[in-house]
């Protein structure tokens, strides 16, 4: 059943769900200050519009009264316990910016019919893609998997001059949320990237993952693994890697490797990082000096989901129309607005669009190097650097099944 | 966090969640109907032990907010907040009646520390097996595995005679909550049934099912499926059907089969119905007039969950123990009790244990007839009708892979 | 429009270099790559390199692995290639061509005839 | 490197009359990444520089005669020239940019008879 709205005579509010489970262990203290500076923003171009209304958050905390407290595996019921908070406080905004834990997220839809907008700093899973009501402002699982099945068809480039279609995944359960999903999306057999590959196996024990390193009878000399630089040494140490092996790191919302004066250590020759490119505007701004370069993408997601808010209340209030409408509910989605670091993109499924970079190690200056770009509006990798000083042969990424000769 | 309990000085109480959305469509009155013949039948076993307590059931119901109301599919969250509701209202009992739709059971063990005793009238999924707080008054899903691989591996009754390896399973996702999660175990790759097995293949389109029944190619004549003979008529129709097919439909809370004057249709010739045997006391029971055959296991359950809840309070107040100790919640396991039908035995795991019947139909009389029973306590097949009058040739099931000869 | 203009025609002596430059207008200069095409006279098209004017980067075809360098100046938008250690069978027609979409060729410079003769 | 074989190597025509030309890869064209196939081809008049006719295939670009059209799959491809005018004499180069490196046929010289 649906629950009245605090949105309509010139008053508009975001209810902000503040869950004690969260994608990223962001204190909700932040995540306050980038709501709030949101808003100011928000406020600023509602004015300039000429538009003279109230925008505010309400923030909902959970109790923390039966859940357990932390990560996001046993967040399923909290976004849900919420919503039952909003409903019987009378509180529901024009728009919930709801959980960043998929389980939580993909609950709400399960057991409720959301007829407003939800916006989410998360919902990586491939559970939460497709949702009617649904934007994600952080990168989701199916941008990744499309990423990986454009990059091993590629074959037109200087350097990478073969299609792959094998693969080795590494995933042992103790991952970040934003790892977590994503390494479901790749190892679930009805995914794309699963579709596409003619052979792919997950590796979960720490053994199985060191042992292919020199294995003569491995299946694909490329293996996919997420997290950051510091999780793969403790997994591979110093060992010595075949030469033909390629390991994938997925770090998206990782700006570490853009920060000044920063080596990468010889462990992370064999290693391509797939990252974003940061925002500049971000490293200046008042909400983020305590944030750690992980946690800037998440902190950003919440003030451009305020941004996003404001940008679709003006865009209404400017046509006339009504807010708390299934037509305001829809509309989230397949679009550009301009977020607090520049224009962001939205597609069809209100998934946020992005520029994946691929990164290398220079085996010459041991720094990281842009190896290329890949755009999740148009699915279109982009060359950047044509002649990578790479540790592989002929400074050409291998083929992915090593061709042994006779046998 | 844990919760106060009103379950002291004299004055014990069960909480009995209200679910919207419940395993079986059972009005709630029934369930508070059997909850109150139960506490009545309680309050005389004290009073004739010479324990002079207070014995009561608290109904927590669901305000219906924001739950999508019916099945168990959107259940998850249910439990949780009934739990939150209690927490609330300082009005835990010493034993909760807790959900009878595996997510929501399920999530209440993950999101939650649960340090009391909670009792199920189903939660019959893989994922709630062996959880030390939660005793199921319903035959679980993991009770059904053990008795096909037993069933499967026998050959050494007159009328079975081969070893079985192989399976069909018809599983179209519209079962019932129970055969939901009976289906559910027999598919997961991790469960014993799958693992006993050389050869199983789930059938998810009616076509599918429909064309195996005379495909020669076929990889195996048993096809397990779920539901009660008009759920396999709708199915099966009047097709033809090979003479080497064998059907086990698994219709566990059904009394049908035993009612006087019923009649076996033809369609169920090539069918094995794997049923309980009724209480027939439960037939006379004040409460139980308006139930149907397929009602009374799930009214019984929760009659039984208010006896057993006074033979743990009765044996802890009998020796002097406290009831709001860890040591009560793990109590409720590895026992029989007096049922209100006759002796229940609880598994070292809480589960009950039951006497399963097979039924064929008797191609003379056109009625059911019990083929064998299996103790599922002690994993023991029992055969009645040594001489059954089959369908199948030579009155012996056929063996699950037929012999083609040469190719 | 899109413009490619390239440098004028040039005569060397075998063993020197030669530079010819293509300056690009009429759209984001370093948004596209740019590709180095030659011809020798009677012959057909053969691809000599690419480079990437937004960060410079090159790939070059083995053949000219190690004689030729591809540089770019955003300030002037125009991209250069030299050719060192010149012989008479370098002896063609340059040209400069915008990659439009991933190894498109879509625009082409008029073409620079270098002549490589003692 | 794909090997892109032209032929005929040269083509005499009559003004007004159809001609056609092949080009076949050694390998697909077919891009996997993107399901597309990057075979274009280009013009040369004598003197000048080549100017792209078609691109992935069959995709006239901008200012191009409707006379000319472009068909074919995997590694068999065809330009056609319905009706051959005097403007049309040159040089055609069939290119493929499906794999790294770009590499161009041979070229087939268009002459009238």
């Known amino acids: 059943s649906q629950v009245s709205q605090n949105c309509h005579n010139g008053s508009y509010e975001i209810s902000v769900l503040m869950m004690d489970n969260s994608a990223f262990a962001e204190p909700l203290e932040n995540v306050e200050d980038a709501v709030n500076e949101g808003l100011e923003i928000v406020r600023g171009r509602l004015q300039n519009a000429g538009l003279n209304v109230t925008v505010n958050a309400s923030f909902m905390y959970s109790d923390g009264l039966i859940h357990n407290s932390g990560d996001c595996r046993s967040s399923t019921c909290e976004g849900l316990d919420l919503l039952r908070k909003i409903s019987n406080a009378k509180r529901m905004g024009c728009v919930l910016m709801g959980p960043s834990c998929t389980y939580s997220t993909f609950q709400m839809y399960l057991d409720t019919e959301l007829s407003y907008p939800m916006i989410s700093a998360g919902s990586f899973g491939l559970s939460c893609d497709y949702k009617e009501t649904l934007t994600r402002l952080m990168s989701p699982a199916r941008k990744l998997t499309y990423f990986l099945v454009n990059f091993w068809k590629t074959n037109d480039l200087p350097f990478k001059t073969y299609s792959w279609s094998t693969s080795y995944v590494y995933k042992n359960g103790t991952e970040s949320e934003d790892c977590f999903w994503y390494l479901n999306a790749l190892e679930a057999s009805v995914s794309y990237f699963s579709h596409e590959l003619s052979f792919k196996l997950v590796l979960r024990q720490d053994k199985e993952f060191q042992d292919i390193l020199m294995d003569h009878n491995r299946k694909s000399n490329v293996i996919v693994m997420c997290g950051d630089p510091q999780f793969l040494y403790k997994l591979k140490g110093d060992r010595a890697v075949a030469e033909d092996i390629v390991i994938i790191l997925v770090d998206l919302f990782n700006d570490q490797y853009f920060e000044d004066n920063v080596t990468a250590p010889d462990y992370m020759k064999n290693v391509l990082v797939l990252t974003q490119s940061p925002g500049n505007s971000l490293l200046n701004s008042s909400f983020s000096r305590n944030l750690s370069p992980t946690k800037r993408d998440f902190a950003l997601a919440y003030l451009n989901g305020i941004l996003l808010f404001g940008h679709m209340l003006k865009t209404f209030l400017e046509n006339g129309e009504n807010i708390t409408t299934p037509k305001f509910a829809h509309a989230f989605r397949n679009l550009t607005f301009e977020g607090y670091d520049g224009p962001v993109t939205l597609d069809d499924w209100g998934d946020v669009d992005s520029t994946m970079v691929l990164l290398y190690t220079s085996v010459d200056t041991k720094k990281y190097k842009v190896l290329l770009t890949y755009d999740t509006h148009v699915n279109q990798t982009n060359p950047v650097d044509m002649s990578p000083t790479f540790t592989w042969k002929n400074s050409k990424l291998p083929n992915d099944i090593t061709d042994r000769g006779p046998q | 966090s844990q919760v106060s309990q009103n379950c002291h000085n004299g004055s014990y109480e069960i909480s009995v969640l209200m679910m919207d959305n419940s395993a079986f469509a059972e009005p709630l009155e029934n369930v508070e109907d059997a909850v109150n013949e139960g506490l009545e039948i309680v309050r005389g076993r004290l009073q004739n032990a010479g324990l002079n307590v207070t014995v009561n059931a608290s109904f927590m119901y669901s305000d219906g907010l924001i739950h999508n109301s019916g099945d168990c599919r959107s259940s998850t969250c249910e439990g949780l907040d009934l739990l939150r509701k209690i927490s609330n209202a300082k009005r835990m009992g010493c034993v909760l009646m807790g959900p009878s739709c595996t997510y929501s059971t399920f999530q209440m063990y993950l999101d939650t520390e649960l340090s009391y005793p909670m009792i199920s009238a189903g939660s019959f999924g893989l994922s709630c097996d062996y959880k030390e707080t939660l005793t199921r008054l319903m035959s679980p899903a993991r009770k059904l595995t053990y008795f096909l691989v037993n069933f499967w591996k026998t050959n050494d009754l007159p009328f079975k005679t081969y070893s079985w390896s192989t399976s069909y399973v018809y599983k179209n996702g519209t079962e019932s909550e129970d055969c939901f999660w009976y289906l559910n175990a027999l598919e997961a790759s991790v469960s014993y049934f799958s693992h006993e097995l050389s050869f199983k293949l789930v059938l998810r389109q009616d076509k599918e099912f429909q064309d195996i029944l005379m495909d020669h190619n076929r990889k195996s004549n048993v096809i397990v499926m779920c539901g009660d003979p008009q759920f396999l008529y709708k199915l099966k129709g009047d097709r033809a059907v090979a003479e080497d097919i064998v059907i086990i439909l698994v219709d566990l809370f059904n009394d049908q089969y035993f009612e006087d004057n019923v009649t076996a249709p033809d369609y169920m010739k090539n069918v094995l119905v794997l049923t309980q045997s009724p209480g027939n006391s439960l037939l006379n029971s004040s409460f139980s007039r308006n139930l149907s055959p397929t009602k009374r296991d799930f009214a019984l359950a929760y009659l039984n969950g208010i006896l057993l809840f006074g033979h743990m309070l009765k044996t802890f107040l009998e020796n002097g123990e406290n009831i709001t100790t860890p040591k009560f919640a793990h109590a409720f396991r590895n026992l029989t009790f007096e049922g209100y039908d006759g002796p229940v035995t609880l598994d070292d795991w809480g589960d009950v244990d039951s006497t399963m019947v097979l039924l064929y139909t008797s191609v003379d009389t056109k009625k059911y007839k019990v083929l064998l029973t299996y103790d599922t306590h002690v994993n023991q097949t029992n055969p009645v009708d040594m001489s059954p009058t089959f369908t199948w040739k030579n009155s012996k099931l056929p063996n699950d892979i037929t012999d083609r000869g040469p190719q | 429009q899109v413009q490619l203009v390239q440098s004028g025609a040039e005569v060397k002596k075998p063993g020197a270099s030669v530079k010819v430059s293509c300056k690009a207008s009429g759209y984001t200069f370093t948004s596209y790559y740019m590709h180095w095409v030659r011809q020798a006279p009677g012959q057909g098209l053969e691809w000599m390199g690419i480079i990437n004017p937004s960060g410079g980067s090159t790939s070059y075809a083995q053949e000219f692995q190690g004689r030729v360098t591809m540089t770019r100046d955003t300030s002037t938008s125009t991209v250069y290639m030299e050719l060192s250690s010149l012989r008479s069978e370098d002896t063609a027609v340059y040209y400069c061509a915008r990659d439009g979409q991933w190894l498109q060729f879509d625009y082409w410079g008029q073409g620079t005839l270098v002549t490589v003769s003692s | 490197d794909i090997v892109m074989t032209q032929s005929p190597l040269s083509l005499p025509v009559t003004l007004g009359q159809p001609a056609s030309i092949s080009c076949r890869s050694s390998?697909?064209?077919?891009?996997?990444?993107?399901?597309?196939?990057?075979l274009s081809w280009y013009h040369q008049r004598p003197g000048q520089s080549p100017r792209r006719l078609i691109y992935k295939v069959s995709n006239r670009d901008s200012g191009v005669p409707d006379r000319f059209s472009g068909s074919g799959s995997d590694t068999d491809f065809t330009l056609k020239i319905s009706r051959v005018e005097t403007e049309d004499v040159g040089i055609y180069y069939c290119m493929q940019g499906s794999h790294w490196p770009p590499t161009f046929g041979q070229g087939t010289k268009v002459e009238i008879k």
């Open positions: 390998q697909s064209l077919l891009k996997k990444s993107d399901g597309n196939t990057y």
